[in-house]
């Protein structure tokens, strides 16, 4: 089955700048600003566009050692990024893949809203584990806030 979870979160960072840092340079930035969450991001194949495969490794003590993500779409004009978790982590006997869509929308106050959709593709009749959805959401929030704190302090970065 397919189970869809949608969330919204806000940032004080303008949409274009956040897209540049959080989406386009996340591979470089995440291990630097959130070493407690991501230990490394390795490009397995591709140049960042659709079809690119990345291996994200987690620090010791995490329930999973790594996940592999596949980039599905990068829309620089509309600040949209789609990717799928295809290997490692929770992917296995009951879960085929997780398809994720992130859209960053500018707000009138100069900040932005992140609209996030996570589609869990389970095998057969298997349900999605609530703790996995929660963990995934918390990881996204951790990374966003870490990037936001870095960007607030470095006004010259990612402009």
């Amino acid at each position: 089955g397919v189970f869809n979870y949608e969330t919204e979160t806000t940032s004080v960072i303008p949409a274009a700048r956040l897209f540049k840092a959080f989406i386009l340079d996340g591979d470089n930035l995440f291990p630097k600003v959130a070493p407690q969450a991501i230990s490394s991001v390795e490009n397995i194949e591709g140049n960042g566009g659709p079809g690119t495969i990345k291996k994200i490794s987690f620090p010791e003590g995490f329930p999973f050692k790594y996940v592999k993500d596949r980039v599905d779409e990068v829309d620089h004009t509309n600040f949209k990024y789609n990717y799928s978790v295809i290997e490692g982590g929770p992917i296995g006997d009951t879960l085929e893949k997780i398809s994720n869509e992130i859209k960053i929308v500018a707000t009138p106050d100069g900040g932005s809203i992140l609209k996030i959709s996570n589609k869990y593709h389970t095998k057969g009749d298997h349900e999605v584990k609530a703790e996995q959805v929660k963990a995934s959401k918390e990881m996204g929030e951790t990374l966003l806030r870490a990037v936001e704190s870095y960007l607030l302090a470095h006004s010259d970065a990612y402009n």
Partner: antibody, heavy 119, light 104 residues
Framework: EVQLVQSGAEVKKPGDSLKISCKGS????????IGWVRQMPGKGLELMGI????????KYRPSFLGQVTISADKSIATAFLQWSRLTASDTAIYYC????????????WGQGTLVTVSS | DIQMTQSPSSLSASVGDRVTITCRAS??????LNWYQQKPGKAPKLLIY???NLQSGVPSRFSGSGSGTDFTLTISSLQPEDFAIYYC??????FGEGTKVEIK
């Protein structure tokens, strides 16, 4: 146990060059930013800049840009702060600090290096 | 660049007093604010990170609050070892000027 050990006190003349060091141990040195903080006599704390040893990415605070050079060598788990031409106003205690995992609070500090510049 | 303004610059208090120090950012820093304590001749020590989180090993009489531009460090019952200088700091960036807590 996380430790940052700084090089010893220095007495220099105006115009001299200087490089002080900060050696990390007890953690993955490559994975955490190191900040350098100046404290002039009787004054407060001033962040000079930060370096990420993993790839030597360096960010300077505006008032220190062009005044000092911050670097790191991950192979020896050491960060550096250097001056090409010291002036009397560089007299201060310089601290290195590890920026921790959660929003960069400086959770471990070196003991400080006193730099005295006098003719 | 964002400026951090601390107040008061100094205060006199007695053991057992409740002490409050404030820190204001020139623009929003969300909750990305840290508090440090420094004693004479010593390196600073992290007390609070991300505005309200107590650093491991720090006594629970220390607490932090605030978000956006206005932040507070509170010592609920001042102890003899708490007489020191306290600094706020925006994560990755500027420190406040410091607040000296002296014995009345």
């Amino acid at each position: 146990e996380v430790q940052l050990v700084q090089s010893g006190a220095e007495v220099k003349k105006p115009g001299d060059s200087l490089k002080i060091s900060c050696k990390g141990s007890g953690y993955s040195f490559s994975n955490f930013w190191i900040g350098w903080v100046r404290q002039m006599p009787g004054k407060g704390l001033e962040l000079m800049g930060i370096v990420y040893p993993g790839d030597s990415d360096t960010k300077y605070r505006p008032s220190f840009l062009g005044q000092v050079t911050i670097s790191a060598d991950k192979s020896i788990a050491t960060a550096f702060l250097q001056w090409s031409r010291l002036t009397a106003s560089d007299t201060a205690i310089y601290y290195c600090a590890r920026l921790g995992a959660t929003y960069a609070g400086a959770d471990f500090w070196g003991q400080g290096t006193l730099v005295t510049v006098s003719s | 660049d964002i400026q951090m303004t601390q107040s008061p610059s100094s205060l006199s208090a007695s053991v057992g007093d409740r002490v409050t120090i404030t820190c204001r950012a020139s623009q929003t820093i969300v909750t990305y604010l840290n508090w440090y304590q420094q004693k004479p001749g010593k390196a600073p020590k992290l007390l609070i990170y991300a505005a309200s989180n107590l650093q491991s090993g720090v006594p629970s009489r220390f607490s932090g609050s605030g978000s956006g531009t206005d932040f507070t460090l509170t010592i609920s019952s001042l102890q003899p070892e708490d007489f020191a200088i306290y600094y706020c700091q925006q994560s990755y960036a500027a420190f406040g000027e410091g607040t000296k807590v002296e014995i009345k």
